[in-house]
């Protein structure tokens, strides 16, 4: 008789990343008998929900279900029906919802409540929706990249640090070299696969690329002599009208808020990298540090150690700017940013006709911000720049916090090294 293939003995998990600018659904898959091995879970699908982040639905909460439908339907198509009921679904909301919660706990709860009700309608094993902390976001990102890189299974192997940039916050997470983590809030202890890790992490709320831009505009308009803001972070010839009410909508600009003699102002781009860089540096308060060393705003940062994976918007922005190659030095990146920002807006629009103008217009700022944050904020140097690896995916799975989050919640990262690898079932009988 002919050998007959047995059905695949696999499991699935779903994590929704409800970020400040958009929501993405990730589907993960792993062999059921190898749950505790490192590196066996992989991403089989990413579905980016078409639309803004969930915090934008605050005035339209009844529509959150409509917004989530397409990607949840996609999950139903990808995962075999027989496994729907045992597939866990988790939703983690990040800094966009943290900011909404700062404005109104009631509104944030209402959004999450509707999200939970919507996701409960699907045939999966819904495990809840919550706003994760910045510390969790950093830690799970670190777990994800090291799990995918196989760093936990290498005896005595070093781990990668994790640099994550979102729209509303940014995280830095790494294992410092024999350095005491002077601030308890920034210290995490993990025991993974039989090894102890003392991890430093910090999440800077309001320092994601979108909120940093709002901060910069709010700071700069304070000293504008009229309703024209000549802005070095936008291309020459670029013009855009901004409502003051939109500028002061976010808690991130509260520290710069003042009564202005106009309701709107016009950004006029002048495209000067150096001036843009200087303006961004004013967002980082480095005058005060109660520790041996700080990043900025009085936040402890140990000396940088080892290699770093820079993902999410660090990767997307640098990829767009064609600056992700390991061969490109920090000096070259700066040089290319100077050229890019100086390019006239009309020229840029012609070169990138398929890109939405709002996003296209912000790459000069975002690229400059990334350089400023890494160099002045986190104290990378021209030499240590070579230890930054801009990564989108690792072996087909997106770098980000979602995989680490699921591994943790499904107890798939054991504290101790499994004694022996379970025998894998033969595919044939």
């Amino acid at each position: 008789t002919q050998n007959k293939a047995l059905p695949e003995n696999v499991k699935y998990g779903i994590v929704l990343d409800a970020g400040s600018s958009h929501t993405s659904l990730y589907i993960y898959k792993w062999p059921a008998e190898k749950e505790n091995d490192t590196g066996v879970v992989h991403q089989v699908e990413e579905c980016r929900v078409k639309g803004p982040g969930i915090s934008k639905f605050v005035q339209k909460v009844n529509e959150i279900g409509i917004y989530l439908t397409d990607c949840m339907e996609r999950a139903r198509e990808v995962i075999p029906r027989s496994q729907h009921q045992e597939t866990p679904v988790y939703l983690g909301a990040t800094a966009g919802m943290r900011l909404l919660r700062m404005e109104s706990e009631e509104l944030a709860d209402r959004v999450l409540d509707v999200v939970e009700r919507s996701l409960s309608n699907y045939p999966f094993d819904f495990q809840g929706a919550r706003i994760i902390t910045g510390q969790e976001e950093g830690a799970y990102g670190w777990i994800t990249i090291n799990y995918l890189l196989g760093r936990f299974k290498t005896p005595g192997g070093s781990t990668f640090g994790a640099l994550d940039l979102g729209g509303a916050s940014t995280q830095v997470t790494f294992v410092p070299q024999n350095q005491t983590i002077e601030s308890p809030d920034n210290a995490l202890q993990f025991r993974l696969y039989g090894k102890d890790y003392n991890v430093y992490t910090h999440s800077f709320l309001c320092y994601g690329k979108d909120q940093a831009l709002w901060q910069k505009l709010a700071k700069d308009i304070q000293v504008a002599s009229n309703e024209i803001l000549r802005d070095p972070c936008f291309h020459p010839g670029y013009k855009k009208v901004v409502n003051v009410s939109d500028l002061y909508k976010t808690p991130c600009t509260k520290r710069f808020e003042m009564t202005l003699p106009f309701q709107q102002f016009e950004i006029q781009g002048i495209g000067n990298y150096q001036q843009c860089h200087q303006s961004i540096l004013e967002l980082f308060n480095t005058s005060y540090c109660p520790y041996s060393q700080c990043a900025f705003n009085g936040i402890f940062l140990p000396p940088l150690q080892g290699d770093f994976g820079a993902f999410s918007a660090f990767y997307f922005v640098m990829k767009f700017l064609n600056l992700t190659s390991e061969k490109v030095s920090q000096e070259k990146v700066t040089e290319m940013m100077k050229k890019f920002c100086a390019q006239p807006w009309e020229e840029i629009k012609t070169s990138y006709a398929g890109v939405k103008e709002k996003y296209l217009s912000e790459y000069c700022f975002s690229g400059t911000y990334i350089l400023s944050l890494l160099l002045q904020g986190y104290h990378f140097t021209a030499d240590s720049w070579e230890h930054i690896h801009f990564i989108g995916k690792i072996q087909g799975s997106d770098a980000g916090w979602t995989l680490g989050y699921m591994l943790n919640l499904t107890n798939m990262i054991p504290a101790e090294q499994p004694l022996s690898t379970p025998l894998s079932h033969s595919t044939y009988v």
Epitope: K50, T69, S118, V355, K356, K358
Partner: antibody, heavy 122, light 111 residues
Framework: EVQLQQSGAELVKPGASVKLSCIVS????????INWVKQRPEQGLEWIGR????????KYDPKFQGKATMTSDTSSNTAYLHLSSLTSDDSAVYYC???????????????WGQGTTLTVSS | DIVLTQSPASLAVSLGQRATISCRAS??????????MNWFQQKPGQPPKLLIY???NQGSGVPARFSGSGSGTDFSLNILPMEEVDAAMYFC?????????FGGGTKLEIK
């Protein structure tokens, strides 16, 4: 401003095939779904299918499977509809359209191409 | 396939009055607590335009005189007050199940 610009009218012979294009401007094609809709003269609307340009995933009305193939090119922000083995029944106006949420605010809106008239005749 | 039956096939309404168009589905278009019913308007020589999505939500920029209601299999589009620019064809459309389908259309004229 979001715009969908469709290719010009086509006159083709029975049995031939044709590729209609839909150039998207004002937003990134990956941030939406593109639908294709057929309308014969003085008749109703028929949904052919939709494509997610972010990953190429498609959904078709089974009656157009084998007749229509939807593709997209994210580098040129363009969606395509390929129609094969054409007969007079395929003579119609073909629309590309997007409807759904804006990627910045929770506004639900639609945008349609102006339509491409396809005439199949010997 | 889900068949959508619109009624009436044509309708004449006086300016300022209410126009009501009905759409019945051959099976429920509700799923996950959402009614997957949309309404489109089409004028001669123009592409359709979305008016209502998910049974009762107005599309961006759609005048407030257009409203939608219903769930399950029975839905309606209301226009109040009727204006001259509203003379057009109206189509209901379900997106619950592939193949997505449209109703046969209702021609709305001014009385």
């Amino acid at each position: 401003e979001v715009q969908l610009q469709q290719s010009g009218a086509e006159l083709v012979k029975p049995g031939a095939s044709v590729k209609l294009s839909c150039i998207v401007s004002g937003f990134n094609i990956k941030d939406t779904y593109i639908n294709w809709v057929k309308q014969r003269p003085e008749q109703g609307l028929e949904w052919i299918g939709r494509i997610d340009p972010a990953n190429g995933n498609t959904k078709y009305d089974p009656k157009f499977q084998g007749k229509a193939t939807m593709t997209s090119d994210t580098s040129s922000n363009t969606a395509y509809l390929h129609l094969s083995s054409l007969t007079s029944d395929d003579s119609a106006v073909y629309y590309c359209a997007r409807w759904g949420y804006d990627d910045e605010e929770a506004d639900y809106f639609d945008s349609w191409g102006q339509g491409t008239t396809l005439t199949v005749s010997s | 396939d889900i068949v959508l039956t619109q009624s009436p096939a044509s309708l004449a309404v006086s300016l300022g009055q209410r126009a009501t168009i009905s759409c019945r589905a051959s099976e429920s278009v509700d799923n996950y607590g959402i009614s997957f019913m949309n309404w489109f308007q089409q004028k001669p020589g123009q592409p359709p335009k979305l008016l209502i999505y998910a049974a009762s939500n107005q599309g961006s920029g759609v005048p407030a005189r257009f409203s939608g209601s219903g769930s399950g299999t029975d839905f309606s589009l209301n226009i109040l007050p009727m204006e001259e620019v509203d003379a057009a064809m109206y189509f209901c459309h379900q997106s619950k199940e592939v193949p997505w389908t449209f109703g046969g259309g209702t021609k709305l004229e001014i009385k």
